[in-house]
Interface confidence: medium
């Protein structure tokens, strides 16, 4: 056959269906790949196809639209599942022609299982609310499309297991489930069961997410430098190893880029001679403040070293802090030799 | 397990119009220091029930209010003292009713706002 | 805001009676709505949640049905202890900038006991 446009297998979007739930599946063509969409496509002459490759085989097939109860089907650009089998598992294409073009893309589609708890391989979207911020909704994803709005379906919401009849602070409304007040202990997965009828029948969506409960812009702070600090001096004697760590406490900020970093003498480690080295850990609370503590090490240090200015530094979308270390070189002790000596008045 | 309402005084809370009053409600048999909802809500003489705040009896303390009350009306709660308060301000004859104070379900999965109510202050505004 | 509309008020019933109360919503509440009973001197007691959910201890001739805007209690086999003020309340989450929280009651509807 004529050269095709292949933009190879796309695992970008790695997508993931409920076995024996509805799965509508756009063709990534128009939505990654083209500057034009279906209709302006279709107009111009231009037919869509549809194949795919079992899953541990190499042969491409051709999509089998003529099944019982067209359980797979294709409207414009949407391939449709009504439902999804387990082994409809594979890699499908979506090729664009015509007589003298020709486009194509392959994307993973992986049916997953799961069990009476929703537990499964699916990667679950994450859905971050604030720490007793006010109402906050979380929506049910990815239900667009599936029905006509004169259809009503019935929405029933579970966290982890339990169906959420009505929690204290969690208030389920239609496709929203509405956080009167967040805290800690609404940490967990929620998933919406969406069930509507079609052509006498009845199909279920099942959509599960992560809520994680993080801290609240009302109590966020600039950087919080927690060492160095004026009371601790990094006194050294010439040879020893010098080790100052700067440990930076950062309130959770959606989106901020965190950011520490030490000076020395005003310029970054990098841009001087001495052999330094710098050894970054994180770590975060309950509710994603987060710690960076970043250790500034000179193994042997002079006394030239001793002298020079270390500053860490520390910026937030909150603002920016910086703290110099107290470095200085230690008054070596006399010798007792010598002192004894002086005490005889010897010369 | 039941909630005690105080507040009022002896004369069952008889109040000069423009005046203030603190009514309370403090949890016995539990505690709502496991952090609670702690609704009120008033019923004038022969009339329906009037929904006016509820507050989160918790390190928040995020409270909710019902847009008449325009800020005449602050909750406040005591986390060690288990209670949860209502303060009427700028009172006026209107605002005579019976005041009840209402918690939410015990337990996180039968949950409702309004599951355990107090016996109720009347509260009567008058020169 | 929202406004619940309670209907009808009052109504009678025979013992061993049927009572039916409807309450309407001005917004869509979904199953938000619970029921209550009020005896005079007494404060409210819940009977019903999340429209259909009974209440601890409350008996089976009590039932809840309704979602979204339109809401029914209905008491069978009514007992002459049953008489007594019945209140809806809708319950209604308002995302704006400070988020609201709306708890509104129906009027009210007296059932008088024959």
């Known amino acids: 056959s004529e050269r095709c446009d292949d933009w190879g297998l796309d695992t970008m979007r790695q997508i993931q269906v409920f076995e024996d739930e509805p799965a509508r599946i756009k063709c990534p063509l128009f939505e990654h790949f083209l500057k034009f969409n279906y209709s302006t496509a279709h107009s111009a002459g231009l037919t869509l196809i549809w194949y795919w490759t079992r899953q541990d085989r190499d042969l491409e097939e051709p999509i089998n639209f003529r099944l019982p109860e067209n359980r797979i089907s294709k409207e414009k650009d949407v391939l449709w599942f009504r439902p999804t089998l387990l082994n409809d598992t594979g890699n499908y294409t979506c090729m664009l022609r015509n007589t003298t073009y020709c486009s194509k893309v392959a994307f993973p589609l992986e049916v997953v299982q799961k069990d009476s708890c929703f537990n499964s391989p699916m990667k679950l979207p994450v859905h971050k609310l604030y720490i007793e911020y006010g109402i906050q909704r979380i929506t049910c994803p990815n239900v667009d499309g599936y029905f006509p709005s004169s259809v009503k379906p019935t929405i029933t919401w579970y966290m982890g297991c339990y169906k959420i009849q009505n929690f204290n602070n969690v208030i389920p409304e239609g496709m929203n489930l509405s956080f009167l007040i967040a805290l800690i202990s609404n940490n967990g997965n929620y998933t919406c069961v969406v069930t509507y009828p079609e052509n006498g029948r009845t199909f279920h969506l099942t959509r599960t997410l992560t809520v994680k409960v993080v801290g609240s812009p009302k109590n966020a702070v600039p950087p919080v430098i927690h060492s160095p600090n004026d009371h601790v001096v990094y006194e050294k004697e010439p040879g020893e190893e010098l080790l100052i760590p700067c440990t930076v406490y950062f309130s959770f900020l959606m989106d901020s880029r965190n950011e520490v970093w030490w000076t020395i003498d005003g310029k970054k480690p990098d841009d001087i001679t001495i052999d330094v080295t710098i050894n970054e850990s994180i770590s975060h609370s309950r509710t994603e403040d987060e710690t960076r503590t970043q250790i500034l090490s000179i193994k042997k240090v002079t006394s030239e070293d001793l002298k020079r200015s270390y500053v860490c530094h520390a910026r937030s979308a909150k603002g920016e802090v910086a703290k110099a270390a107290k470095v200085k070189q230690k008054v070596p002790a006399p010798r007792y030799t010598v002192e004894l000596a002086c005490g005889f008045g010897a010369t | 397990q039941q909630l005690e309402q105080s507040g009022g005084g002896a004369e069952g809370g008889l109040v000069k119009p423009g005046g203030s009053l603190e009514l309370c409600c403090k949890a016995s048999g539990f505690s709502l220091s496991n952090s609670y909802w702690i609704c009120w809500v008033r019923q004038a003489p022969g009339k329906g029930l009037e929904w006016i705040g509820c507050?989160?009896?918790?390190?928040?303390?995020?409270?909710y209010y019902a847009s008449w009350v325009n800020g005449r009306f602050t909750l406040s709660r005591d986390i060690d003292q288990s209670t949860g308060c209502l303060q009427l301000n700028s009172l006026t004859a209107a605002d005579t009713a019976i005041y009840y104070c209402a918690r939410d379900g015990a337990t996180s999965t039968s949950g409702h706002l309004f599951e355990l109510w107090g016996q109720g202050t009347l509260v009567t505004v008058s020169s | 805001a929202l406004v619940m509309t309670q209907t009808p008020s009052p109504v009678s019933a025979a013992v061993g009676g049927t009572v039916t109360i409807n309450c309407q919503a001005s917004?869509?509440?979904?199953?938000?709505l619970a029921w209550f009973q009020q005896k005079p001197g007494q404060p409210p007691k819940l009977l019903i949640y999340?429209?259909?959910t009974l209440a601890s201890g409350v008996p089976s001739r009590f039932s809840g049905s309704g979602s979204g805007t339109e809401f029914t209690l209905t008491i069978s086999g009514v007992q002459s202890d049953d008489a007594a003020t019945y209140y809806c309340l809708g319950i209604y989450t308002y995302i704006s900038a400070d988020g609201s929280l709306y708890n509104a009651f129906g009027g009210g509807t007296e059932v008088v006991v024959k």
């Open positions: 507050i989160y009896v918790g390190s928040s303390g995020s409270t």
């Open positions: 999340r429209a259909s």
């Open positions: 917004e869509d509440i979904y199953s938000n």
